[in-house]
Amino acid sequence: QPSVSPGEPSPPSIHPGKSDLIVRVGDEIRLLCTDPGFVKWTFEILDETNENKQNEWITEKAEATNTGKYTCTNKHGLSNSIYVFVRDPAKLFLVDRSLYGKEDNDTLVRCPLTDPEVTNYSLKGCQGKPLPKDLRFIPDPKAGIMIKSVKRAYHRLCLHCSVDQEGKSVLSEKFILKVRPAFKAVPVVSVSKASYLLREGEEFTVTCTIKDVSSSVYSTWKRENSQTKLQEKYNSWHHGDFNYERQATLTISSARVNDSGVFMCYANNTFGSANVTTTLEVVDKGFINIFPMINTTVFVNDGENVDLIVEYEAFPKPEHQQWIYMNRTFTDKWEDYPKSENESNIRYVSELHLTRLKGTEGGTYTFLVSNSDVNAAIAFNVYVN
């Protein structure tokens, strides 16, 4: 027992005075704790804990499950322990089959021994399957077998603890290792659309897709320069073991002009963070803005060609476009097309192709366009010399 200065509290004394004790199954366990301030005995093995308020712990017929650490504590909170092995040839292992490991960390296969003097205490694959060649472990008869530096490739590995008894391998119950992956890159985030243009009262809905190795990735929608919590809905999927996908959908059921702004989808894990933004512009009503690509007053020589070209912004989409000359609508000689194939495109081009103009074909050529909210027009004055 440790020597202590007089007057200073000392830890309790245990008989037998050894750190480990081996008894045979069926034999008696008798442990005596000597301390004037004795409080209790505590027994621990795996996740089991028992207490005893008597200073002498007696188990008349020891069983394998009595294997474990017996700790005596006094009123000063000082303690002393003895580890008891109950040697039972029919039950060499005590087992807690839950087995989780974090990638790159060590994890404990909880199969403590009832006999510390067995040999070849190790791990074996289930049904004779090989274990990973790089797997390494540290055996501890009181705790189990610690797998060193768990790899992602060990996920769903089926294994047994194993010892040799009389020249034969004895296996524990099986364990299935579940590996929690470590984050080794930032999450991958993408957004359904980079920009949105809506009219007041329309629904705004945008989806952010977050991809990572596990569901413990954090994600949120934020409005730039605002702390307001946004309403999101989530859907998620596991595509295989380390391929997790979450869709976070942000919805504003009736958008207002002051909802306009930049919305950020932010995701982070222990490795780092990533974000992607989308821009919302809400207008009180639709619009059309027309921009002539040539001067609206055109001088042309008799017999020459001229192209009247306009670009225009229209939101919502243009519904009717026409070129008019002297109250008559052109049915051909003109084309109208979007400026880009992007689904957010609101810019269009319209071209009227006038060929071999005669002196009588001078005058006002008008382009008219309308959508569900507004009409707009632009006139070109053409002079033929």
Epitope: S122, L131, P132, K133, R136, F137, I138, D140
Partner: nanobody
């Protein structure tokens, strides 16, 4: 870097005993494993025994179980192989091996040990 030095080899009659020692210089840790392998002329190096540094758990080849005992002295950073009831087929060069990463799942595979001694000759005459 770890250096391993074996000693204790020699010539012995069948049925006799020898005790091999392997002294490790350099730091040992809880993950340490030390083992003995042997190689007879014209044969592949084979596992004999190993011991984990922290808990002193022992590992033996079937061919030596019950005859050989591996042990360690943490204070001296030394591992011992007590060889009793020696047979002529135990004749070989005995190598000490060590690794700092833990006991390999295939502890009998010599390729999984990082550090090796120069070897000591054991000859058992009939």
């Amino acid at each position: 870097e770890v250096q391993l030095v074996e000693s204790g080899g020699g010539l012995v009659q069948a049925g006799g005993s020898l005790r091999l020692s392997c002294a490790a210089s350099g730091r040992t840790s809880g993950s340490y494993v030390m083992g003995w392998f042997r190689q007879a002329p014209g044969k592949e190096r084979e596992f004999v025994a190993a011991i984990s540094w922290s808990a002193g758990m022992t590992y033996y080849a079937d061919s030596v179980k019950g005859r050989f005992t591996i042990s360690r002295d943490n204070a001296k950073n030394t591992v011992y192989l007590q060889m009793n009831s020696l047979k002529p087929e135990d004749t070989a060069v005995y190598y000490c091996a060590a690794d700092q990463r833990g006991v390999p799942a295939y502890y009998s595979d010599y390729a999984l040990y990082d550090y090796w001694g120069q070897g000591t000759q054991v000859t058992v005459s009939s």
